[in-house]
Interface confidence: low
């Protein structure tokens, strides 16, 4: 999906008002220094591409983020403020329903959400210092 047509300011408002708090709630009890940020992004569309990938694509050791509150709100924000996004996600949603039966918080998931926090922060302050 090409995220260049999204309404970035509306997505930013959704992040600041709710998604950021849900991410903090998910990470509660974890030290902010526990994980190193290894994923970054340079422009807001690039950030959304990385955020979508980390939030909704199952990874080894963490296949259960899609049903978390922050993920559902992220999906809603993208669906509302990115034209045509919902249509591209129909097949992906069917796959997620099969893959994610229960919510399990693993250390890998905590690390992934820590990366997401970094990506969202970069979304609000884009322009990577170096490519």
């Amino acid at each position: 999906y090409d995220f260049t047509n999204c309404d970035f300011e509306k997505i930013k408002a959704a992040y600041l008002s709710t998604i950021s708090k849900d991410l903090i709630t998910y990470m509660s009890g974890t030290k902010s220094t526990e994980f190193n940020n290894t994923v970054s992004c340079s422009n807001r569309p690039h950030c959304l591409t990385e955020i979508q990938s980390l939030t909704f694509n199952p990874t080894a050791g963490c296949a259960s983020l899609a049903k978390e509150m922050f993920a559902m709100k992220t999906k809603a924000a993208l669906a509302i403020w990115c034209p045509g996004y919902s249509e591209t996600q129909i097949n992906a949603t069917q796959a997620m329903k099969k893959a994610r039966k229960s919510k399990v918080t693993t250390n890998k998931c905590l690390e992934q959400v820590s990366q997401l926090q970094g990506l969202w922060r970069r979304f609000n302050r884009p322009l990577l210092k170096q490519q």
């Epitope: 047509n5 422009n43 807001r44």
Partner: antibody, heavy 117, light 107 residues
């Protein structure tokens, strides 16, 4: 209304330094990055570097790393570009421009720097 | 560094003509390309960003498109105020680089 107002034209001798200012108004200064671009007479646009006003982190292209210094004064919402060891090929119009995603939605009016002996 | 090759360097056209300017990136920059218009003695003005998004206040006769690493700025019907120099610029990552410019002159 967003405005970037630059300092006036400068005439300098080779080997001297010049400091160009860019005063921002009409938006939150620390939200946007400030980039500097120059244009030699009759030539195209050349990117010099950028500064993040929120933390003063700068990135300069290699050819300017030793001679250019980018700074900001958050209290006055002003960005500065200082270029030292001036030579004749530094004669150009210097622009500041603000950006979030790397494209420039507002530019300063430009500052002409003439280097001549 | 990413090189931006812009063509033609100049062109002559008449009012009402359809004008096309192209810019080729030396590597994949996705949709991270902007177009600017510059008139003599003035600062550049943003026309298009993210390859095809029209900047605020820019007339709809301007449009941008992308195919791989080739980017196109089209003016569907040239107006007297459109005679100027046009620059492309990638905004994919540092260092930002510009194309050499295209001067659009009156035929």
């Amino acid at each position: 209304e967003v405005q970037l107002v630059q300092s006036g034209a400068e005439v300098k001798k080779p080997g001297a330094s010049v400091k160009v200012s860019c005063k921002a108004s009409g938006y939150t200064f620390t939200t946007y990055w400030m980039h500097w671009v120059r244009q030699a007479p009759g030539q195209g646009l050349e990117w010099i570097g950028m500064i993040d006003p929120s933390d003063s982190e700068t990135t300069l292209i290699q050819k300017f790393k030793d001679r250019a210094t980018l700074t900001v004064d958050k209290s006055t919402s002003t960005a500065y570009m200082e270029l030292s060891s001036l030579r004749s090929e530094d004669t150009a119009v210097y622009y500041c421009a603000r950006t979030l995603d790397g494209y420039y939605d507002y530019w300063g009016q430009g500052t002409t720097v003439t280097v001549s002996s | 560094d990413i090189q931006m090759t812009q063509s033609p360097s100049s062109l002559s056209a008449s009012v009402g003509d359809r004008v096309t300017i192209t810019c080729r990136a030396s590597e994949n920059i996705y949709s991270y390309l902007a177009w600017y218009q510059q008139k003599p003695g003035k600062s550049p003005q943003l026309l298009v960003y993210f390859a095809k998004t029209l900047a605020e206040g820019v007339p709809s006769r301007f449009s941008g498109s992308v195919s791989g690493t080739q980017f196109t700025l089209t003016i569907s019907s040239l107006q007297p105020e459109d005679f100027a120099t046009y620059y492309c610029q990638h905004h994919y990552g540092t260092p930002w680089t510009f194309g050499g410019g295209t001067k659009v002159e009156i035929k």
